[in-house]
């Protein structure tokens, strides 16, 4: 059920920096039995269901909703990061009555921290990962999916937010990082540059790949994503980047070939239900670990990140659909909606394999390799 | 109270055709993917066709394909199936269910609806 | 023949615990798709009984329970209760057929 269209499972190379998207750019649905907040009427969202900030949107949970769209959020904000060699353009502005973090772009003012203060935080996301500076873990176990197959109906909403292209997900599709460290998927969201210009949002050695898609996910426990903003593992999300392959990948074009139908801003549409978890890497075990923050304001820190070692391959038909086909608030390209990379400052990325170890081509000169932190969690 | 109210049946010869419906209330109806299950005399349960909450997209049963239209009335909270050509083997209680649970059960079902297909 | 294969029948004292299996394949049950349960009381619509290969809508005994491995998933009925006895069913999706499958249905009998 996997995608067979992964690239090798060669650690992941590269390095750039870009924009952060925990909550703030993708909504986030609420858990399946848990109360959510509703996003403002007006909005096309079902009932029950409401707008958080952070990593795209992020909405709280609520009850099994009677309705076929049960679980809707709306867009959250996000912030701009600083410094960006690549800086992405002006184009993801969200303004939302009544949100204190609408008024936030990517590339450009208001600063972040003016936005929310969090975006000035310490531990913040994304990150550049450096598979020799990572420390293995060996209790860093494969990933557990379930639930992750849909049925085509009910069908799911995907909605052009502004910042991103947003798929809300439906209750039950469960994740576990761990024992005792379990999850519920909420929505994923997707972040890519523009022609010629790469725009993930992680890079790896100062490498950044095309694109980068987030499954946003709560832990199971708490019921809403606002009581989990800022906690230490309320929330968690699963990166993996998309690169270029020769063949078109049938699990995105699902959702890419409806892309046009979301052109405009604020505008959704109702998609097939599909296997969510053919959108991953095949490979669950090996992947970078560490907490950081969503990569969108309100920029909340104590999100778990895990990062596949193993990408995603599209054609690049698809890549150029999936940068060259939404548009932003006003007349601007839906483009280079990433966060700069940010510093780690002491914080260590684990690693659930030997990373360090004939990994990178780059490995010439002997490195202190950490030592891993976590050490049965 | 959250119900759906079917309506339609009768007898009919082969080759005949029939339309059923499927009145909600109680509940959204426009927000909610809709099937028809028909379960034959002493037999089981066999989903016949489905829609989604818009309308836009349909799906069949091979058994059905060509000959059974399922369509909906959001402004009239209502589900229809158009059955044409109809055979001996469509003889059935027919169910219109929702399929609002988004694990892919159906969580709210009609009385049901005879139809008896003979010369 | 049904997609989804149940026992014809089952049957259990009253206290007792019974179970009736569904077994599917690897284009249904086994791709990852959830089974859910229906009971069908005799000249009535079947009522939707576990959902999400273990969920309970709400108004459904908790004697009432299901799993799922692999190909194959179970309803359980513990301290069976003379109305129980009636007809069960298991339904999921199949991306092979491009449809909602059923079982063939299983009837429980409480001696």
């Known amino acids: 059920q996997r995608l067979p269209r992964m690239q090798e499972d060669s650690p992941l190379g590269g390095g750039s920096s870009g924009e952060d998207d925990p909550l703030g750019e993708e909504d986030l649905p609420s858990e399946e039995d848990s109360p959510r907040e509703e996003d403002p009427p007006g909005e096309e969202d079902l009932p029950g269901e409401e707008d958080l900030p952070g990593e795209e949107d992020l909405p709280e949970v609520k009850p099994k909703s009677e309705e076929e769209g049960s679980l809707k959020l709306e867009d959250l904000p996000t912030v701009e990061a600083p410094g960006d060699p690549q800086e992405p353009q002006n184009n993801a502005h969200r303004d939302k009555e009544g949100d204190d973090q609408s008024h936030w772009r990517y590339g450009g003012d208001p600063p972040w921290p003016r936005v929310s203060p969090a975006c000035a935080g310490r531990f913040q996301s994304p990150v550049d990962i450096r598979p020799q500076l990572a420390a293995f873990c060996p209790a860093l176990r494969p990933l557990e999916l379930l639930g992750f197959q849909l049925p085509p109906l009910p069908e799911l909403r995907l909605r052009n937010n502004g910042h991103s292209v947003q798929l809300t997900l439906p209750p039950g599709l469960e994740m576990a990082l761990g024992p005792g460290r379990e999850y519920r998927a909420l929505q994923l969201h997707l972040h890519w540059g523009a022609a010629g210009r790469p725009g993930s949002e992680h890079t790896v050695e100062g490498h950044r790949f095309p694109a980068e898609i987030h499954v946003v996910h709560l832990s199971t426990a708490f019921a809403r994503v606002d009581e989990a903003l800022g906690r230490p593992g309320g929330l968690a999300v699963l990166a993996a980047f998309l690169e270029e392959g020769p063949e078109e990948n049938s699990a995105y074009e699902q959702l890419l070939s409806r892309l046009e139908e979301i052109a405009e801003e604020g505008s959704e549409t109702q998609v097939p239900g599909l296997d969510i978890s053919a959108l991953l890497p095949s490979d669950f075990s090996r992947y970078f670990q560490y907490e950081g923050s969503l990569t969108t304001p309100p920029c909340a820190q104590g999100v778990i990140w895990t990062v596949f070692n193993q990408t995603v391959m599209l054609s690049a038909k698809q890549l150029h659909t999936l940068s060259d086909t939404l548009w932003g608030p006003g007349d601007s390209r839906l483009q280079l909606n990433f966060r700069a990379t940010q510093p780690l400052n002491g914080r260590v990325i684990e690693a659930s394999f030997p990373a360090g170890v004939d990994s990178s081509p780059r490995a010439a000169e002997p490195v202190q390799l950490n030592s891993c932190l976590a050490a049965g969690d | 109270e959250v119900q759906l109210v079917q309506s339609g049946g009768g007898v009919v010869q082969p080759g005949g055709s029939l339309r059923l419906s499927c009145a909600a209330s109680g509940f959204p109806f426009s927000s909610y993917a809709m099937s028809w299950v028909r379960q034959a005399p002493g037999k089981g349960l066999e989903w016949v066709s489905a829609?989604?909450?818009?309308?836009?997209?349909?799906y069949y049963a091979d058994s059905v394909k060509g000959r059974f239209t399922i369509s909906r009335d959001n402004s009239k909270n209502t589900l229809y199936l158009q059955m044409n050509s109809l055979r001996a083997e469509d003889t059935a209680v027919y169910y219109c269910?929702?399929?609002?649970?988004?694990?892919?059960?159906?969580?709210?079902w009609g009385q049901g609806t005879m139809v008896t297909v003979s010369s | 023949q049904s997609v989804l294969t149940q026992p014809p029948s089952v049957s259990g004292a009253p206290g007792q615990r019974v179970t009736i299996s569904c077994t599917g394949s690897s284009s249904n049950i086994g791709a990852g798709f959830d089974v859910h349960w229906y009971q069908q009381l005799p000249g009535t619509a079947p009522k939707l009984l576990i959902y999400?290969?273990?969920n309970r809508p709400s108004g459904v005994p908790d004697r009432f329970s299901g799993s799922k491995s692999g190909t194959s998933a179970s309803l359980a009925i513990t301290g069976l209760q003379a109305e129980d006895e009636t007809d069960y069913y298991c339904?999921?999706?199949?991306?092979?057929?491009?449809?909602?499958?059923f079982g063939g249905g299983t009837k429980l009998t409480v001696l």
């Open positions: 269910a929702n399929n609002g649970n988004y694990r892919g059960a159906f969580d709210i």
């Open positions: 829609i989604s909450a818009n309308g836009g997209t349909t």
């Open positions: 339904q999921s999706y199949d991306s092979r057929l491009s449809a909602w499958v």
């Open positions: 999400g290969n273990t």
